[in-house]
Amino acid sequence: SGTTNTVAAYNLTWKSTNFKTILEWEPKPINQVYTVQISTKSGDWKSKCFYTADTECDLTDEIVKDVKQTYLARVFSYPAGHVESTGSTEEPPYENSPEFTPYLETNLGQPTIQSFEQVGTKVNVTVQDEWTLVRRNDTFLSLRDVFGKDLIYTLYYWKSSSSGKKTAKTNTNEFLIDVDKGENYCFSVQAVIPSRRTANRKSTDSPVECMGHEKGESRETGHHHHHH
């Protein structure tokens, strides 16, 4: 019979960063393989990752169709070597995932400082806009395109010679900050969605970039450093 020795998947977990979304589960299969289905609350089930021995399934292509929808997935367990049979009416064991709303729950990926430029006592710091797999009219959208003003960046900056940090915020991808002339500064940024009230409202901090280390250009000194 079709489901002998098969066990339901468990620990179904959504792993999602910048809308790249993978469903993971346990256990590593022994006598079984898995098929995943996903749907919106009002939609039909769509099958993905047919008869896989993996314990994960990339569902990005489905959730990017509407990142503000709420999705539910389920993982079915079939006997290893299973070939779908029209005669089988026995439903295989399955487990439902938690609900997942990409716009509210995808983690913000680590941002990158694209460049900084010093003019006198001002420094312009630019954050790289990350591309996502969300599309509009066959064009991939950036993180800023998707979140708009819901997404802000926090800049942490400090003199290379001290540890006292200052902060600035922007709802664009650029900061313009005042600095002391003749001092080198270090920078790190963090992406934030202030409207979120959960642990995923902030990204991890970007790598630290410091003046005089390849990332920016200074009109003070005439040295030009280009971002690779």
Epitope: I22, E24, P29, E56, D58, A80, G81
Partner: antibody, heavy 125, light 108 residues
């Protein structure tokens, strides 16, 4: 045949981050296996740290989870271990290994069939 | 966490003798997840047995594995000089994957 080679600093200062890389040669890291890190304290047994699938999904030992990050670079056929806030208790030989799912006669079997030679990491100031 | 307890801790035997090593799990482990490894000083572990009873490629037939559930056994039918080493059982089914504490097989 597939070979694994660990690389990274042999000496790390307390509170710093231990970083090791495992390079896969003679095969592809994207070939459907899991890739693990294991360590062995001096004169002691083996401790599994965590594993990564080529797609980037990870499983970690809960006892180390708060300090461990394992990542993969499929373009270089490498996977890496970062262990933060190290202490002398993290002094060990660190091994990378391939965890293979093997399908036979209607079922899957799992085992670590290829190991690196190991690299000794000492945590000391 | 599944605790694997190996016994004895040390086994003192002569070449040609039979070695029987035990691995007991704190909860049931599918045989598909149970493996045995051999480790010599200064070397990485080497896979001997997977699936509780299947020999890995290139492993001599004097090594055999058996058992199911919570009790597993590695048997070396006739010890050769190169077999004196430490042997570990391991389960790779339930996170965290765990190893037994090892059994040292030494020359008597």
């Amino acid at each position: 045949q597939v070979q694994l080679q660990e690389s990274g600093p042999g000496l790390v200062k307390p509170s710093q981050t231990l970083s090791l890389t495992c390079t896969v040669s003679g095969g592809s890291i994207s070939s459907g296996q899991y890739w693990s890190w294991i360590r062995q304290h001096p004169g002691k047994g083996l401790e599994w740290i965590g594993e990564i699938y080529y797609s980037g999904s990870t499983r970690y030992n809960p006892s180390l989870k708060s300090r461990v990050t394992i990542s993969v670079d499929t373009s270089k056929d490498q996977f890496s271990l970062k262990l933060s806030s190290v202490t002398a208790a993290d002094t060990a030989v660190y091994y990378c290994a391939r965890d293979t799912p093997y399908y036979y006669d209607g079922g899957y079997y799992y085992y670590m069939d290829v190991w690196g030679k190991g690299t000794t990491v000492t945590v000391s100031s | 966490e599944i605790v694997l307890t190996q016994s004895p801790g040390t086994l003192s035997l002569s070449p040609g003798e039979r070695a029987t090593l035990s691995c007991r799990a704190s909860q049931s482990v599918s045989s598909s997840y149970l493996a045995w490894y051999q480790q010599k000083p200064g070397q990485a572990p080497r896979l001997l047995i997977y699936g509780a009873s299947s020999r890995a490629t290139g492993i001599p037939d004097r090594f055999s594995g058996s058992g199911s559930g919570t009790d597993f056994t590695l048997t070396i039918s006739r010890l050769e000089p190169e077999d004196f080493a430490v042997y570990y059982c391991q389960q790779v089914g339930v996170v965290p994957y765990t190893f037994g504490g090892g059994t040292k097989v030494e020359i008597k």
